[in-house]
């Protein structure tokens, strides 16, 4: 059978200072179990941009309704899109455990802002 | 339709072993984790394994003893228990797992259970 | 692991009567509750997830509520197929995946 792939189809969004960013995200599969988390960046300095369990993300919704069932669209939306957010974000699936494991990384989507419309 | 059937029950003694099999239909068996649920008599319902792909889970009570598998090419789940005890005597049923959103699982699909009665 | 304690755990009421059954979490498991219905010799049935969506094909009788740790599972008009065993199961935090010890809806 075919292993779960984390898709990120684009590579790069660009957006205007103050808009919304959406950075789209599916998987191919239901299994194995466990959470999908975003980062921005890679390796042991990254950063947690949305969880779904843990922690406070006022800045980010996800676009899949919270009810749909069998999920596997897992893009975000961040609002309010400054030049601090730029870089290179990570749709990232992990394996349940104690604790979660990492399984599969998408290929990532970098983040460009531009200069807001004068 | 959705249908789940399990089979493999019986009396067995204490220290004994007894595999259980359901076989799924009516759904893509591979693309969803599977669930055992057991009742002991007049009891309510208790979480005891869950498997995904390679992904196995198990309550504490069952851990060592027990093991989950699957044949997606037969669309079957399997449970083999080994080392029973006369608390593992209860209607063993097994569940398709489902999804919401991006929480965890709960059990849309059962089906109507094996009895497995451990006894000296 | 979360422990579900279900009130009461018996439940007398008469038909066409309004139901209410309650499970509390012992910590917070924001929506993921599911409730499920288990009539004698059968397999339990799933009514609701997510707390308060209702599973296709059950009733509109049936409702759900509450988040966190306080959960309510609502028959508005009780008919005779409705006496049966209610389990609420958290799906938050596991393994272990943990239902509540049921509430059992009988004729009054």
């Known amino acids: 059978e075919e292993e779960l792939q984390v898709i990120q189809p684009d590579k790069s969004v660009s957006v205007a200072a103050g808009e919304s960013a959406i950075l789209h995200c599916t998987v191919t599969s239901l299994i194995p179990v466990g959470p999908i988390q975003w980062f921005r960046g890679a390796g042991p300095a990254r950063e947690l941009i949305y969880n779904q369990k843990e922690g406070h993300f006022p800045r980010v919704t996800t676009v899949s309704e919270s009810t749909k069932r069998e999920n596997m669209d897992f893009s975000i939306s961040i609002s309010n899109i400054t030049p601090a957010d730029a870089g290179t974000y990570y749709c990232v699936k992990f394996r349940k455990g104690s604790p979660d494991t990492e399984f599969k990384s998408g290929a990532g989507t970098e983040l460009s802002v531009r200069a807001k419309p004068s | 339709d959705v249908q789940l059937l399990e089979s493999g029950g019986g009396v067995v003694q204490p220290g004994g072993s007894l595999r259980l099999s359901c076989a799924a239909s009516?759904?893509?068996?591979?693309?969803?984790?599977m669930t055992w649920v057991r009742q002991a008599p007049g009891e309510g319902l208790e979480w005891v394994s869950t498997?995904?792909?390679?992904?196995?889970y198990y309550a504490d009570s069952v851990k060592g003893r027990f093991t989950i598998s699957r044949d997606n090419s037969k669309n079957t789940l399997y449970l083999q228990m080994n080392s029973l005890r006369a608390e593992d005597t209860a209607v063993y049923y097994c569940?398709?797992?489902?999804?919401?959103?991006?929480?965890?699982?709960?059990?849309?699909?059962w089906g109507l259970g094996t009895l497995v009665t451990v006894s000296s | 692991e979360i422990v579900l304690t279900q009130s009461p755990a018996t439940l007398s009421v008469s038909p066409g009567e309004r139901a209410t059954l309650s499970c509390r979490a012992s910590?917070?498991?924001?929506?993921?509750l599911a409730w499920y219905q288990q009539k004698p010799g059968q397999a339990p049935r799933l009514l609701i997830y997510?707390?308060?969506i209702r599973e296709t094909g059950i009733p509109a009788r049936f409702s759900g509520s509450g988040s966190g740790t306080e959960f309510t599972l609502t028959i508005s008009s009780l008919q005779s197929e409705d006496f049966a065993v209610y389990y609420c199961?958290?799906?938050?935090?596991?393994?272990?995946?943990?239902f509540g010890g049921g509430t059992k809806v009988e004729i009054k």
């Open positions: 997510a707390a308060r």
């Open positions: 910590q917070n498991v924001k929506n993921d």
């Open positions: 199961q958290q799906y938050y935090d596991w393994p272990p995946f943990t």
């Open positions: 498997i995904g792909s390679g992904d196995t």
């Open positions: 009516g759904f893509s068996f591979s693309n969803f984790a």
């Open positions: 569940a398709k797992d489902s999804t919401v959103s991006w929480s965890g699982d709960f059990f849309d699909y």
